[in-house]
């Protein structure tokens, strides 16, 4: 009987243990306003907090300016990127802009990047009106695998919002793979 | 070995009852359109459905036009609000217009609010054209404690949209705090 | 003792089974670009992708154009949609646009269909710019009942982007029906 | 920027009238709510009167209404007050302000919803 119980204690133990270890992944990055790339062009956006504010990672690693995957899974990745221009900062070099977010999986193992998502909209911010604002927003459902690395890219970086509720992306865990 | 039996058995027991009571919480709330708040400026919506439609609520609260958290958690945070205006409901103060939404958190322990997500645009609503719509969606993955508040907050609550598939918001647990 | 084993043994075995069976379904479907409906009337898309590049299904059905739920409970459903024209593409017939997408939920039983989110904008794509781009995404939490069915609506379907991190929708259960 | 330059103001005997000016540079005057307020010698500056972008709406502070009639030439980039019926309680300076961003011609009643501010002409109403 104490073998058996002993048995079924194990299991528990065992349920319990990868439960706790295995615990599901996530991250909550927002934007590191004190280093955002100048410009108008498409750049990859790599300074990211994770440990401050609402900013938060657990059982994945951020480095480089990329969210790395620990655990393979489907995982919903998010994006929010808010931009904003203020007559008070000058003039914009055009009126006529492309605001655009693109998150983007690379595999280490296959050197290549993909772009999972996009969004984004063509705008004319006239010189009419004192201040601008545009947010975009994307989610999605994908399969990650250990050591596939997520990052950001934008346009226009120089216009980018930097509050933490404004631009940030984030990952969740959802369920493993069959 | 009855006893082995029954605390084996007992142990699935408070399994499935935990289970059961602490069953992942969840909420999706709609606008409350016979309540919409007049004016322009930035301002708390209050009125939303939990029991109708597509509304609906589950071991969560809400109350005093927020959403209350009743269990410790991660939590993933959504929000979808339409902004419409027809030429027959008359002419708008301006074409220039900032539509805008702000979820915040309200602690009641340490009373303060923070905004944890937010969205929109600057648009111009020319009056050249008879109709007007917009959209904005956030969304994103945030550590919620028992007590804690979500509120909506927009800028133009009479351009909203009042159909349940236009402005809504939401929460559901993804996981527990480690 | 051995019967108490074999039942709690048997008891894991049917939780394991139970799990592996009815693992959390899911989907992310993405635009079929060889088969999208002209025109700028309001239209339901019914070319998906379900197994190529990121497009993925599992235990839910896609069948003529919608995504059919095989298994009760409560579901995150998210969509998003691109819309772009080049001026290469030759003069709109209008300027003045509305870019919508409807989210909607067919039930078999009572034949009906409802919108469950919506989202979108009137856009003025002017001829003075060469290039317009807009993005829209809507996301929400619904009770889906086994046989109903999720099908995407747009406005303007020729303007869509055909790209698979542009053009998606996607469902993934959260959690059970009490 | 929205320059704004206020003009017409001076000397009326009560009951007299006054039509005030508001010259506006710089920016598309036609997509921004105007308004009209005013400062009392030792006062607060209180509303006036408000129009939509298109003139085809106007709102007025109760103290005013039936006296005094705003309305604007888009053509022309000018916003104008027409006070009739003067009174020694209407001696202020007077402000036109130009805003935008807000739907609603009532929240045009607040300071507020304003960016840009004239630098005012006095109005005094005295026998």
């Known amino acids: 009987i104490r073998a058996e119980k002993a048995m079924v204690d194990g299991s528990w133990l065992d349920l319990a243990k990868r439960s706790k270890l295995e615990a599901q992944p996530f991250a909550h990055l927002t934007i590191n306003a004190t280093d955002i790339p100048s410009g108008s062009h498409k750049v990859s956006l790599s300074s990211w907090y994770h440990d401050r504010g609402w900013a938060k990672i657990s059982n994945m690693t951020f480095s480089n300016g990329k969210l790395i995957v620990n655990q393979d899974g489907f995982y919903y990745l998010y994006a929010n990127i808010c931009f904003r221009h203020h007559e008070t900062s000058g003039d914009l070099a055009t009126e006529y802009l492309q605001l655009m977010v693109y998150v983007t999986k690379t595999s280490i193992k296959i050197p290549s990047s993909h772009t999972l998502m996009k969004g984004g909209s063509t705008k004319y911010w006239s010189g009419n009106s004192e201040f601008h604002f545009y947010s975009i927003n994307v989610g999605g459902f994908f399969k990650l695998r250990s050591g596939e690395e997520i990052s950001i890219e934008v346009s226009n970086p120089s216009l980018l919002d930097p509050d933490q509720d404004a631009t940030y992306f984030g990952a969740f865990k959802v369920r493993d793979i069959d | 070995i009855r006893a082995e039996k029954a605390m084996v058995d007992g142990s699935w027991l408070d399994l499935a009852k935990r289970s059961k009571l602490e069953a992942q919480p969840f909420a999706h709330l709609t606008i409350n359109a016979t309540d919409i708040p007049s004016g322009s400026h930035k301002v708390s919506l209050s009125s939303w459905y939990h029991d109708r439609g597509w509304a609906k609520i589950s071991n969560m609260t809400f109350s005093n036009g927020k959403l209350i958290v009743n269990q410790d958690g991660f939590y993933y945070l959504y929000a979808n609000i339409c902004f419409r205006h027809h030429e027959t409901s008359g002419d708008l103060a301006t074409e220039y217009l900032q539509l805008m939404v702000y979820v915040t958190k309200t602690s009641i322990k340490i009373p303060s609010s923070h905004t944890l997500m937010k969205g929109g645009s600057t648009k111009y609503w020319s009056g050249n054209s008879e109709f007007h719509f917009y959209s904005i969606n956030v969304g994103g993955f945030f550590k919620l404690r028992s007590g804690e508040e979500i509120s909506i907050e927009v800028s133009n609550p009479s351009l909203l949209d009042p159909d349940q598939d236009a402005t809504y918001f939401g929460a559901f647990k993804v996981r527990d705090i480690d | 003792i051995r019967a108490e084993k074999a039942m709690v043994d048997g008891s894991w075995l049917d939780l394991a089974k139970r799990s592996k069976l009815e693992a959390q379904p899911f989907a992310h479907l993405t635009i079929n670009a060889t088969d999208i409906p002209s025109g700028s009337h309001k239209v339901s898309l019914s070319s998906w992708y379900h197994d190529r590049g990121w497009a993925k299904i599992s235990n839910m059905t896609f069948s003529n154009g919608k995504l059919i739920v095989n298994q009760d409970g409560f579901y995150y459903l998210y969509a998003n949609i691109c819309f772009r024209h080049h001026e290469t593409s030759g003069d709109l017939a209008t300027e003045y646009l509305q870019l919508m997408v409807y989210v909607t939920k067919t039930s078999i039983k009572i034949p009906s269909s409802h919108t469950l989110m919506k989202g979108g904008s009137t856009k003025y794509w002017s001829g003075n710019s060469e290039f317009h781009f807009y993005s829209i995404n809507v996301g929400g939490f619904f009770k889906l009942r086994s046989g109903e069915e999720i099908s995407i609506e747009v406005s303007n379907p020729s303007l869509l982007d055909p790209d698979q991190d542009a053009t998606y929708f996607g469902a993934f259960k959260v959690r059970d029906i009490d | 920027e929205v320059q704004l330059v206020e003009s017409g103001g001076g000397l009326v005997q009560p009951g007299g009238s006054l039509r005030l000016s508001c010259a506006a540079s710089g920016r598309t005057f036609r997509s921004y709510a105007m308004g009209w307020f005013r400062q009392a010698p030792g006062k607060g500056r209180e509303f006036v009167a408000a129009?939509?972008?298109?003139?085809?709406?106007?709102n007025y502070a109760d103290s005013v209404k039936g006296r005094f009639t705003i309305s604007r030439d888009n053509a022309k980039n000018t916003l104008y007050l027409q006070m009739n019926s003067l009174e020694p309680e209407d001696t202020a300076v007077y402000y036109c302000?130009?805003?935008?961003?807000?739907?609603?011609?009532?929240?045009?009643?607040?300071?507020?919803?304003?960016?840009?501010w004239g630098q005012g002409t006095l109005v005094t109403v005295s026998s």
């Open positions: 302000a130009a805003g935008s961003g807000y739907a609603s011609l009532s929240y045009y009643s607040t300071e507020r919803a304003y960016t840009y």
């Open positions: 129009i939509n972008y298109s003139g085809g709406s106007t």
